[in-house]
Each structure stands twice: as C-alpha cells, then as structure tokens.
C-alpha cells in the first residue's frame, strides 16, 4: 500500500481541519487507514481520524481541533494497520480555508434595489470574524451570457444592486464565498445558491 499524493490539509480556523490525499490504488479508506494527529504541546494526546473515501483512490479526513492560534503545530501520521505510510506536520494558521457564508437571502421588496444579505460564518470572538471579505456571484439561468462577480470589501455582509441593472422578467441566482486577507487564506467554498425572479420594471417615463 502506497501514498500517491501526500496529505494536504486546510483549517477552517475554528474547529475542523480537512486533509485530503490519494492512494496508489483503490482503497477502502475507512477500513484500511487511520490518520493520527497530535498538537505539539505539553501533555497533549494523540487523536485518531477515520478517513472517508473521496473518489476511487482519494481519501479525506476531518480532524477535530481546538480554536486555532498561530503557534499551533500538529504532527500527522498516516497508518495502514501497523505500517506507517507517511509522516508530516501541519500548521493550521498557515493553511486556512474559511467556512462558507450561510443564509444567503435576496430581498426584492426594497424600492429599485435588490438587496442580498448573508451571515458571517464565524462567531464574533473568532479572529476571522472581522477579516472576511466576500465575492458574490450573480448569474442568470435564462441568459447564459450573464455572470457577474461583485467584490464586497467592507465588513457588512450585504450587497445592494440597482434592480435596473438586471433584466426584467427573468430569474437570477446568487452565491457568495469568503476569504480573509490578513490570514492569506484561500477562498471558501461557495454558499448554496439562492434564486429570485426580477420583476422590476422601470417607470414609464424612463422607458
């Protein structure tokens, strides 16, 4: 049994780190493998993660962790029974992928404006809470040529779009993702998308 692609891990900077790797051949990850991890810290214990399959030769493990601080460093050992397949380390603060924003809602009852709101995925006491900026993707199922990215670089998780910039009488979808500039993170996954119908019509005089 051999590791084809070494484990690569990312942290959500809250409580979960996700490690993914590829094996040399088809593997029942949960039955054959264990990923052991231990914080390099006085009197810390070794913890075990049972991986799941992620495609035929891929495995993924979700490591339960404490709140992340910059000093945290974990040792990682990938075992197949009594055989050590790989040994490495992981510093969560240097490999951050934020959680996806949630509760994306579209408010169309605001005059002349489409208001999108979503929730910050972190509690106020988390360091990422005040560092997230967002990208909102809006596209139309009726008009495949229409897709826009709106960068939200302010803290408030809202975006206002003049309804007049969207075509009337067709449906749109939106989704949002986040990243944290000062932590040099990757982008989060996209939130689930939400759909709305743009029924806005310009006043007669402006037509």
């Amino acid at each position: 049994m051999k590791v084809l692609q070494e484990p690569a891990c990312v942290s959500d900077y809250m409580s979960i780190s996700t490690c993914e790797w590829k094996m040399g051949g088809p593997t029942n990850c949960s039955a054959e493998l264990r990923l052991l991890y231990q914080l390099v810290f006085q009197s810390s214990e070794t913890h075990t993660c049972v991986p799941e399959n992620n495609g035929g030769v891929g495995c993924v493990c979700h490591l339960l962790m404490d709140d992340v601080v910059s000093m945290d460093n974990y040792t990682l050992d990938l075992w197949a029974g009594q055989q050590l397949l790989w040994k490495g380390s992981f510093k969560p603060s240097e490999h951050v992928k934020p959680r996806a924003p949630g509760n994306l809602t579209v408010h169309t009852n605001v005059s002349d404006t489409v208001l999108l709101t979503w929730s910050n995925p972190y509690p106020p006491d988390n360091y990422l809470y005040n560092d997230l900026t967002y990208a909102v993707n809006i596209w139309s199922e009726n008009d495949p040529a229409y897709s826009r990215i709106h960068n939200v670089t302010y803290l408030k998780p809202t975006l206002r779009i003049p309804a007049s910039t969207l075509k009337s009488g067709i449906s749109y979808r939106a989704r949002v993702r986040a990243w944290a500039q000062h932590y040099n993170t990757t982008w989060s996954e996209w939130s689930p998308s939400t759909k709305w119908y743009n029924s806005y019509r310009e006043p007669f005089e402006q037509r």
Partner: antibody, heavy 125, light 112 residues
C-alpha cells in the same frame, strides 16, 4: 474535596530503588496530566517528571532520565514514580501535583492547582 | 531549557505595605494572546506549595484578591497590594510552557 496523597518514601541506600505512589480523589483522575516535583533539604523546587492523562506521553528531567519511570493506573486513580539507581542527590521531599486537563486537543492549563502533602526520600549509606 | 530568574531573593516588608516580586524568563512564555505559561506559587514553612496565579494573571480559586499577576512574554510580576502576616514564605515563579518545567530560585518574604 480534591486531594492527592503520596506514599512510598523512606530511607534507601545509593543504587537502591523506591516506588512512590500518589492517590487522587475528588476529580476525574484520567482527564488530568500529573506531575512530580521535588525539593531537596533547604533548596528550591525542581520539576522531576510529568505524564499525560492517558499515560501515553511521559516527560523527564535530564537528572532522572533513564533512572526514574513515571506511570499511572487510571482504574485506581493512582500515579507512580519508580525510582531506580538512587543517588544521594535524589534526597528530597517528593510532591505530586495535578497538571493540565489533557482531554482537550490543546490541553487546558489551570496551574499545578492541587499538591500532595509530600513524601520524604532519603538516599544514604 | 528555559531559565527563570527571580528578584529580589529576600523581601522584608512591613504589614499593610505593598510588595512586588519580579520574574524574567530566558525565552517568551507567550503561546497565544493572553496565554503566558507562567505561574506563581507560595510555600509556607513546613507546607506544600500552593498555587496563587496561573497563566500569568489568573488568580487561583480561593486566593485573596490582594495577590495579582502581570506581564507578558519574558517579564512577569507578582504584586501583593497589602502584605499580611500570613503571607510569609517562599514565592516561586514557574514556567509551564514546555518541559522541563523550570522554577525561579525563590523569594523569601518576611515581615519587618
């Protein structure tokens, strides 16, 4: 009441052995790392050894490494210090102390918040 | 190993007056914001040590509020706002960031 009670001290000749015990009560013993600290007559405090809650992680001062062994029996709520190849400089009062909570991914530290009454070890010919 | 240096080693104090003990470590004891792994212990004559302050500034359960800890990184201070006769004994700082845990030499507080 949270309590630690040491026993097993005594007079031993150089090169001899002693086994110290520390019985814990009033707290969930297996959740806490434990530590041994000693104090030679008229001297300050010196850390000797520590062990994680499960017993998998053990740590020793250079002065006792290879001679002393720390262990624990969580079913008996008891900490041990096996002392071999004793030397005159091991003469001291030995204290056990409750250390950090190691059930967490990053063990929670509240100081060495409970100490035993101490047991005296004298190494002399 | 981390070296802990205490001063003064002897501290005569008049009851009711404040007292201050300093402790310097040879490397930073700050693990994360607000978490300095330094403790203060008091050992009274013929007794086991007792915890006063942990993580630099957190008062242990049952410790009178006249005791306070401060500092960060490598420089730490234990203050007693008004010394009482029962406060006599040896005071030790200890680093618990990593093993070997190391203690300061001890400060003997006595009443003038």
């Amino acid at each position: 009441e949270v309590q630690l009670v040491e026993s097993g001290g005594g007079l031993e000749q150089p090169g001899g052995s002693l086994r110290l015990s520390c019985a814990g009560s009033g707290f969930t013993f297996r959740d806490s790392a434990m530590t041994w600290v000693r104090q030679a007559p008229g001297k300050g405090l010196e850390w000797v050894s520590s062990i994680s809650g499960s017993g998998d992680g053990t740590y020793y001062a250079d002065s006792v490494k290879g001679r002393f062994t720390i262990s624990r029996d969580n079913s008996k709520n008891t900490l041990y210090l096996q002392m071999n190849s004793l030397r005159a400089e091991d003469t001291a009062v030995y204290y056990c102390a409750k250390d950090r909570l190691s059930i967490y991914i990053r063990p929670r530290y509240y100081g060495l918040d409970v100490w035993g009454q101490g047991t005296t070890v004298t190494v002399s010919s | 190993d981390i070296v802990m240096t205490q001063s003064p080693l002897s501290l005569p104090v008049t009851p009711g007056e404040p007292a201050s003990i300093s402790c310097t470590s040879s490397q930073s004891l700050l693990y994360s914001i607000g978490y300095n792994y330094v403790d203060w212990y008091l050992q009274k004559s013929g007794q086991s040590p007792q915890l006063l302050i942990y993580l630099g500034n957190k008062r242990a359960s049952g410790v009178p509020d006249r005791f306070s800890g401060s500092g960060s990184g490598t420089d730490f201070t234990l203050k007693i706002s008004r010394v009482e006769a029962e406060d006599v004994g040896f005071y030790y700082c200890m680093q618990a960031l990593q093993t070997p845990y190391t203690f300061g030499q001890g400060t003997k507080l006595e009443i003038k």
